[in-house]
């Protein structure tokens, strides 16, 4: 594998997702090199002239950085020596989505890997019992999603049942005119049953569970990013 006396080194990236309006991380690792001053990290984005970020000789070099990323990027400097070239991206926006390349050059050799960065919005759902309805119903709300997700209900007792006829889902555009609030109401629920509200788009899947008994209401929520790794 020798090229000019240098070898290829293994660089590994993970498809990752950024939640717009938050800081995000583009993950990249490489074979560690104890000589920090000999490590060069370059992040590039397909279709963008100039660099996303450059770190060399133990410090940032932003002289070639593209305007779009000015003031927004950082590597985890203290972790570079152990092979972490991940990039922190401040205030992720939809336009940050795309194909990125993590390029590494060390005293051991050089290598690169591409990363597909997806951007959107995803949030935890909250389920509450809606006592105002004529019959007992459940209201599942999640404040921020993009692209528009699908919403499905499930129940522990009636496994495999289709609840689309007894539920109503609406999407309300948020003030920044990108993300949307998701509201889904499930009607005619029965006591002593566990219901799940599942919200999913191509970036994330979130599930909210609620168990309603005569004496108490128990809730649980979880969120997972899709296509990571």
């Amino acid at each position: 594998f020798g090229i000019s006396g240098k070898h290829f080194i293994t660089v590994t990236t993970f498809t990752s997702a950024g939640n717009i309006g938050e800081d995000g991380t583009l993950s990249c690792t490489f074979e560690p090199d104890i000589k920090l001053n000999g490590i060069v990290i370059q992040w590039l984005k397909e279709g963008i002239k100039g660099l996303v970020h450059e770190f060399k000789e133990g410090k940032d070099d932003l002289s070639q950085q593209h305007e779009m990323f000015r003031g927004r990027t950082a590597v985890f400097a203290d972790q570079v020596v152990v092979g972490n070239a991940s990039l922190r991206l401040k205030n992720v926006q939809l336009t940050d989505a795309g194909t990125y390349t993590c390029y590494i050059h060390t005293s051991k050799g050089k290598g690169n890997a591409n990363l597909e960065y997806k951007t959107g919005a995803f949030s935890m759902p909250e389920i509450n019992v809606d006592y105002n309805a004529s019959s007992e119903s459940l209201r599942c709300e999640a404040p921020r999603w993009f692209p528009q997700p699908t919403v499905a209900w499930a129940s522990q007792v009636d496994q495999g049942a289709n609840f689309s006829e007894v539920s109503n889902t609406s999407f309300e555009l948020n003030s920044e005119n990108v993300t949307m609030k998701v509201v889904s109401v499930l009607y005619n629920v029965t006591i002593n049953n566990t219901y799940s509200c599942m919200i999913e788009n191509d970036i994330a899947k979130a599930t909210g569970d609620i168990k309603v008994t005569d004496s108490e209401v128990k809730r649980r929520s979880q969120l997972e990013l899709l296509n990571s790794g």
């Epitope: 717009i20 309006g21 938050e22 932003l62 000015r70 003031g71 950082a74 401040k90 205030n91 003030s175």
Partner: antibody, heavy 116, light 109 residues
Framework: EVQLVESGGGLIQPGGSLRLSCAAS????????MNWVRQAPGKGLEWVSV???????DSADSVKGRFTISRDNSKNTLYLQMNSLRAEDTAVYYC??????????WGQGTTVTVSS | EIVLTQSPGTLSLSPGERATLSCRAS???????LAWYQQKPGQAPRLLIY???SRATGIPDRFSGSGSGTDFTLTISRLEPEDFAVYYC??????????FGQGTKLEIK
């Protein structure tokens, strides 16, 4: 014109509560990281709280559990709810926008005095 | 927690002179996340430099920023009377999310 205008400061007794407001014009609050920064008399700047574009919040340890940052998107306004106020919370409170490259827009500040 | 230490605490210079203000971080700070502010008495701070070396909108070119890692510098090439103020460096990204230096007072000699 991009502008931030704070209000709601005043004299309050220790243990009391106060809500500061920051009205924004010329830009959309929910698209930026919005902050509260304070400055005690004769002292330097101290970061207090942030609300991200996503709506998630974070605060300095000194105010955690006592101060809550929030926003009303329909009013394009930022708030700081301050509870269990202490003498050391006496300061000028500024709201400031972080437009990805530093706190580029600041309000004129509102003074909070905690004293019995 | 990253601590930013500014030096000197007070700098006494005359108009026309060159001012060099230092900001040292207790651990490495990304150049992208380092900013400088100017504050005059009774006024809100004003952003001067972001990304360690980029001038904010409307800032005269006599102001320049440099440095990386743990050592950053704000330079005012030729002092004007309106430049006498307090200057703060600030970093973003660790806990607490925003940290300011204690400030350097630039006063007329």
């Amino acid at each position: 014109e991009v502008q931030l205008v704070e209000s709601g400061g005043g004299l309050i007794q220790p243990g009391g509560s106060l809500r500061l407001s920051c009205a924004a014009s010329g830009f959309i609050v929910s698209r930026n990281y919005m902050n509260w920064v304070r400055q005690a008399p004769g002292k330097g700047l101290e970061w207090v709280s942030v609300i991200y574009g996503s709506g998630r919040t974070d605060s300095a340890d000194s105010v955690k559990g006592r101060f809550t940052i929030s926003r009303d998107n329909s009013k394009n306004t930022l708030y700081l709810q301050m509870n269990s106020l202490r003498a050391e919370d006496t300061a000028v409170y500024y709201c400031a926008r972080d437009a990805d490259y530093g706190l580029d827009v600041w309000g004129q500040g509102t003074t909070v005095t905690v004293s019995s | 927690e990253i601590v930013l230490t500014q030096s000197p605490g007070t700098l006494s210079l005359s108009p026309g002179e060159r001012a060099t203000l230092s900001c040292r971080a207790s651990q490495s700070v990304s150049s992208s996340y380092l900013a400088w502010y100017q504050q005059k008495p009774g006024q809100a701070p004003r952003l001067l430099i972001y990304g360690a070396s980029s001038r904010a909108t409307g800032i005269p070119d006599r102001f320049s920023g440099s440095g990386s890692g743990t050592d950053f510098t704000l330079t005012i090439s030729r002092l004007e009377p309106e430049d006498f103020a307090v200057y703060y460096c600030q970093q973003y990204g660790s806990s607490p999310l925003y940290t300011f230096g204690q400030g350097t007072k630039l006063e007329i000699k």
